[in-house]
Amino acid sequence: DITPSVPPASYHPKPWLGAQPATVVTPGVNVTLRCRAPQPAWRFGLFKPGEIAPLLFRDVSSELAEFFLEEVTPAQGGIYRCCYRRPDWGPGVWSQPSDVLELLVTEELPRPSLVALPGPVVGPGANVSLRCAGRLRNMSFVLYREGVAAPLQYRHSAQPWADFTLLGARAPGTYSCYYHTPSAPYVLSQRSEVLVISWEGEGPEARPASSAPGMQAPGPPPSDPGAQAPSLSSFRPRGLVLQPLLPQTQDSWDPAPPPSDPGV
């Protein structure tokens, strides 16, 4: 039973492998990998590429097996697959492996890029699209504008990027974006470098992110990892802090006034 012999394609259909609370987590979080077979199984195996023997076994007479990874470290990140088998199959015969699940354990997601399409110079009456591009799919992207405390726009994207459209008349300004996991426990990216959008005839000016007034690096996620992403008004702002935010719509937010802070 140690070395699985994989049967011919589609002989025993593959199971599904998922992660709770998420596939991208910070170190120290408890992660459960759940392998679900399309039929009741008898034994489940969790595999990592390059390893002949399963990393973990679960003998469960059910369609579901859970593998617990306690207080994960970055070293436990990587690619996982699972298989299942039944006692009435031949010795060592396992199902097709699940699709890969990539577990990423990191304190911070890589910095996204922010570019203007077609370019950072806006002609009269023309709109401009800002693309915030990270490296991971299914993330929530947030666009900020210097001088506006609330996020300018918010997008959840299945792609590793999100496009934000700015109306020409209101486009000129200094922008920054970041992205984060769509649900708790939140993992935030570094903030992009700022992008200056200017009118035709004024040269765009590149500035390093650190010098952008009124914009700070992302702050920590909310203290309760089980909570939904809060709105900015539900915690104390420190200058402008980039936080995971729950959008009012899936597409975008209108600019909002800065949150009131009665405790100040």
């Epitope: 589609s10 002989y11 025993h12 259909p13 599904w16 492998l17 998922g18 759940r34 679900r36 399309p38 039929q39 009741p40 007479s61 059910s62 369609e63 579901l64």
Partner: antibody, heavy 121, light 106 residues
Framework: QVQLQQSGAELARPGASVKLSCKAS????????INWVKQRTGQGLEWIGE????????YYNEKFKGKATLTADKSSSTAYMQLSSLTSEDSAVYFC??????????????WGQGTPLTVSS | QILLTQSPAIMSASPGEKVTMTCSAS?????MHWYQQKPGSSPKPWIY???NLASGFPARFSGSGSGTSYSLIISSMEAEDAATYYC?????????FGGGTKLEIK
């Protein structure tokens, strides 16, 4: 959209055999188990067995072994159930149903309209 | 085999009333599924994986439970909810259904 279209009502003599069909459309037939469920008039639901059309693998309720035989024809995306040595106890409505087979869903997500079978001399 | 026992077998409720029906399994199951069936029709997937409402169905329905004890709840009964509800497990062969709860409108 996903559809399971079952064959029409059957009338059969005791001791005879009958073959019911379930034609699938709107999805890849070989990706999901097809289940068969029996319901006698005014009674509950009883699982007969399932077939994985991708391989032809079958799993039966012990109660129906020898009574039901499940097959599938990939070329026509049709699942079949043959019932043999019929008795009045086999008079019922027979449903085919697709297993959802998703990480986040494991019920029978689509059902055929049912085939009534009457066994009578 | 896992025996699923539904209770009550028959019940009636007035419009607006809260309705709770239960399904007890003889052994632990990972998930419970629920179907609604009306006379002359196929069963309809109603709640899957214990607590997920199938798309297009009213939010007044909810499901909960774990292990051997599961429930289907209607927060406010409506006339169209009158039907028979079956619980169902796929955690162990043979797959089994409960005997059904017939819900009538008062």
């Amino acid at each position: 959209q996903v559809q399971l279209q079952q064959s029409g009502a059957e009338l059969a003599r005791p001791g005879a055999s009958v073959k019911l069909s379930c034609k699938a459309s709107g999805y890849t037939f070989t990706d999901n188990y097809i289940n068969w469920v029996k319901q006698r008039t005014g009674q509950g639901l009883e699982w007969i067995g399932e077939i994985y059309p991708g391989s032809g693998n079958t799993y039966y309720n012990e109660k129906f072994k020898g009574k039901a035989t499940l097959t599938a024809d990939k070329s026509s995306s049709t699942a079949y159930m043959q019932l043999s040595s019929l008795t009045s106890e086999d008079s019922a409505v027979y449903f085919c149903a697709r297993s959802a087979n998703r990480y986040d869903r494991g019920d029978f997500d689509y059902w055929g309209q049912g085939t009534p079978l009457t066994v009578s001399s | 085999q896992i025996l699923l026992t539904q209770s009550p077998a028959i019940m009636s409720a007035s419009p607006g009333e809260k309705v709770t029906m239960t399904c007890s399994a003889s052994s632990s199951v990972s998930y419970m599924h629920w179907y609604q069936q009306k006379p002359g029709s196929s069963p309809k997937p109603w709640i899957y994986d214990t607590s997920n409402l199938a798309s297009g169905f009213p939010a007044r329905f909810s499901g909960s439970g774990s292990g051997t004890s599961y429930s289907l709840i209607i927060s406010s009964m409506e006339a169209e909810d009158a039907a028979t509800y079956y619980c169902h497990q796929r955690s162990s062969y043979p797959y089994t259904f409960g005997g059904g709860t017939k819900l009538e409108i008062k």
